[in-house]
């Protein structure tokens, strides 16, 4: 039977996606205990049959993937979570539309620093993500968002930073002291979704000057 | 048997408030979305607005964002329409109705006069 | 906002023949997901709250009955009675749900002639 209130039993069902892989995650009410067991369902916009997520039924995990299950990138998702209680008290609450497009939030972009004597070059390797293409193969951030860019900051000291940009994977910082450390961080940038990832960063030295010894 | 039950109608002054209530029977409020729909004497369907009763996410229709609020008490399983600042024109019939997109549940209504 | 224009407002048909309503939305309704139309039509009866007919443009809800119809694709759909009876004597509605706010059409009332 219903407990009085659902969030006794359930709280907080909500997607959490990063870079495309997309995890339900919940939290037990202040009533759940261990035993409590949890079955997930999910549907897209305006459907009415909810279909039951195999793996993710009468589990006592707090978080099923639906990546596979939530994939095209046009389509709005629901997922909803059952909450049965030992005692055999129910309760059932959904998550917000979902679009992976839009509430998708990106990692830090896969970097290679390379220190030279006067530079630093910085290689951006694309970022796989779980999405495929018609046939089959799996789409690159890059592939997804067509206005993607990168935004490079190279820090030479407490009041100076050098910036690079651009949809490229290679860049170079030039004109830089030898034997020197440096803090780079790199960004990916989709202004049309307004999404910025966290940095990524990397301390680097560039190498002595030997031409002088 | 899904039954959605509006009460809290009634006659209103101009410039008053009112808070309607929106009873779920036969399943689980937080189990889908529940929308706001009114219709004016002889008039037409408006749409209000929406709520996602599990996390309480509303989305207005912006002719009343502002005037309505939407929310509702999971323990009781009852979604909660408060209209302010009530004018003549605001006088309908307010329904609630369950889904996310089209509506295959409604409540029977219940009927709002606003008048001096 | 979307706006919805049925016509005709209303119309008379004798029993048994078909009547045909229809709805123009000021901007598509096809759902590139997957290819539907995102419009429902409603059935209104004096003092009753309205009735789901069809959804996605041509899915007829569980216990419509079969004369009841829906067609059409991008801005052009159409309701269709295809034998009129008496208890189909009501006020008919499309609603789209493409974009927010969901919005009606003004109604179409359907009676005997």
């Known amino acids: 039977h219903a407990p009085e209130d659902p969030s006794d039993l359930l709280q907080h069902v909500k997607f959490q996606s990063s870079n495309f892989e997309n995890i339900l995650t919940w939290d037990s009410g202040p009533e759940g205990t261990p035993d409590t067991v949890y079955s997930i369902e999910y549907k897209t916009y305006g459907e009415r049959d909810w279909v039951a997520k195999k793996g993710c039924q009468r589990i006592t995990r707090k978080s099923c993937n639906l990546t596979v299950e939530t994939g095209n990138l046009t389509e709005l998702y629901y997922a909803r979570v059952t909450a049965v209680s030992a005692g055999g008290r129910s309760a059932t609450k959904m998550t917000d539309r979902f679009s992976s497009l839009q509430h998708t939030t990106l990692k830090p972009p896969d970097v290679t620093c390379i220190s030279k004597v006067r530079s630093i070059q910085m290689i951006v390797h694309p970022t796989p993500t779980p999405i495929r293409a018609g046939d089959g193969h799996r789409l690159t951030l890059e592939d997804i968002f067509h206005d993607l860019f990168y935004h490079l900051e190279l820090q030479v000291n407490r009041t100076y930073q050098m910036h690079l940009g651009g949809k490229q994977r290679e860049y170079e910082f030039f004109g830089l002291t030898p034997d020197t450390e440096f803090l780079g961080t790199i960004m990916i940038c989709v202004p049309t979704w307004a999404k910025e990832s966290a940095p990524y960063m990397c301390r680097v030295k560039t190498l002595p000057d030997r031409t002088w010894t | 048997e899904v039954q959605l039950v509006e009460s809290g109608g009634g006659l209103v002054q101009p410039g008053g408030s009112l808070r309607l209530s929106c009873a779920a029977s036969g399943y689980s409020l937080t189990a889908d979305y529940m929308n706001w729909v009114r219709q004016a004497p002889g008039k037409g369907l408006e749409w209000i607005g929406e709520i996602n009763p599990s996390t309480g996410t509303t989305t207005y229709n912006q002719k009343f964002k502002g005037r309505a609020t939407l929310s509702v008490d999971q323990s009781k399983n009852t979604a909660y329409l408060q209209m302010n600042s009530l004018r003549a024109e605001d006088t309908a019939v307010y329904y609630c109705a369950r889904f996310d997109a089209y509506f295959d549940y409604w409540g029977q209504g219940t009927l709002v006069t606003v008048s001096s | 906002d979307i706006v919805m224009t049925q016509s005709p407002d209303s119309l008379a048909v004798s029993l048994g023949e078909r009547a045909t309503i229809n709805c123009k939305s000021s901007q598509s309704l096809l759902y590139s997901s997957n290819q539907k139309n995102t419009l429902a039509w409603y059935q209104q009866k004096p003092g009753q709250p309205p009735k789901l007919l069809i959804y996605?443009?041509?899915s007829r809800e569980s216990g419509v009955p079969d004369r009841f119809s829906g067609s059409g694709s991008g801005t052009d759909f159409t309701l269709t009675i295809s034998s009129l009876q008496a208890e189909d004597v009501a006020v008919y509605y499309c609603q789209q749900y493409f974009s927010y706010p969901f919005t009606f059409g003004q109604g179409t009332k359907v009676e005997i002639k």
């Open positions: 996605w443009a041509s």
